[in-house]
């Protein structure tokens, strides 16, 4: 029998590596069983996470799972950093891994790293 | 049921490159990360790297930097890993393990191939 | 990178007596979510490593309660109470905590 609590599945140490001026949608897969969760983004600020208060963010309901999404109209340059998604459910906090956006600004592009170069340069990819 | 399958045994020669697959049955590979860990004859394990299906964003130890490229195709629900400039350090049985939702904890693992480079 | 020593490298141990392997890494792998992704996996003769205990010491489905994991910060123990013929092999501890990924050297275990 499946678990009826709530879970966030982002995963861990996950990174996503994208560009200034683009649109991006920042997922947060959200499983639950009867009511959907009341759902929230924040951005990590050392050891605190600030909550994104007025940002666009929309559901997308597929058959398995939902998906509370985090919308970038556009990306900008100090979009870059952590970020994690909690539930309100019966009255518990349920936090998701966090999740990295590497944004390369758009006056760079032309000197835009690959996923590999990202790969191979760690004072990019370990901040 | 959950599983792994990888490719058969390669027998290559130095200089040489090499596409190793692997492709999952019972679970989506976007739903996971799948790292690739290599085991030379002498029992020792090291990490290659791993890739995130669903983004593509890839992660290597830098020891397989410009060695190792992984890549993954979420159609065909397979992982491969390309080796390139082959030598005889190369020789190996490389696994595929895949976390389920990203856990890092290496929940499944498949047979292995092996990898012989000989001239 | 995070430096994984595994002792001892062959432990000879007689059915119904107990075992530990000792590993010991070189930077705390308490992670920044409060779990510790110290893991122990088993390779039996002529097959894959299997998981057998992560995040310090959650039993693997279907491992025997015979085998705990225990541990903090840079210094881990598996323990098996009582050896049986199936636990031969070689056991690896890894941690996961910090890129790059890193194994212990392994330690094989023998009846005697």
């Known amino acids: 029998k499946e678990s009826c609590d709530v879970q966030l599945y982002i995963k861990r140490q996950s990174e996503h590596s994208i560009l200034a001026g683009d649109p991006f949608e920042l997922e947060c897969p959200v499983k639950y069983c009867a009511n959907r969760p009341h759902v929230t983004w924040c951005k990590l600020n050392g050891t605190t996470c600030v909550k994104l208060e007025d940002r666009q963010t929309s559901w997308k309901e597929e058959k398995n799972i939902s998906f509370f999404i985090l919308h970038f109209e556009p990306v900008l340059p100090n979009d870059n950093g952590s970020y994690r998604c909690s539930a309100n459910f019966q009255s518990n906090l349920i936090e998701s891994h966090s999740t990295t956006l590497y944004v390369t600004d758009v006056k760079s592009a032309s000197e835009r790293p690959s996923k590999d170069e990202m790969a191979s340069r760690p004072w990019l990819l370990y901040r | 049921e959950v599983q792994l399958q990888q490719s058969g045994a390669e027998l290559v020669k130095p200089g040489a490159s090499v596409n190793l697959s692997c492709t999952a049955s019972?679970?989506?590979?976007?739903?996971?990360?799948l790292h690739w860990v290599k085991q030379r004859p002498e029992q020792v394990l090291e990490w290659t790297g791993r890739i995130d299906p669903a983004n593509g964003n890839t992660k290597y130890d830098p020891r397989f930097q410009g060695k190792a490229t992984l890549t993954a195709d979420t159609s065909s629900n397979t992982a491969y890993l390309h080796l390139s400039s082959l030598t005889s350090e190369d020789t190996a049985v490389y696994y595929c393990?895949?976390?389920?939702?990203?856990?890092?904890?290496?929940?499944?693992w498949g047979q292995g191939t092996t990898l012989t480079v000989s001239s | 990178d995070v430096v994984m020593t595994q002792t001892p490298l062959t432990l000879s141990v007689t059915i119904g007596q107990p075992a530990s392997i000792s590993c010991k890494s070189s930077?705390?792998?308490?992670?920044?979510?409060?779990?510790?992704?110290l893991n122990w996996l088993l390779q039996r003769p002529g097959q894959s490593p299997k998981r057998l205990i992560y995040v310090l010491s959650k039993l693997e489905s279907g491992v025997p309660d015979r085998f705990t994991g225990v541990g903090s910060g840079t210094d881990f123990t598996l323990k098996i109470s009582r050896v049986e013929a199936v636990d031969l092999g070689v056991y690896y501890c890894w941690q996961g905590t910090h890129f790059p990924y890193t194994f212990g050297g392994g330690t094989k275990l023998e009846i005697k």
């Open positions: 930077q705390s792998l308490l992670d920044s979510d409060g779990k510790t992704y």
């Open positions: 019972g679970f989506a590979i976007r739903d996971t990360y």
């Open positions: 393990v895949a976390d389920y939702y990203g856990s890092s904890l290496f929940d499944y």
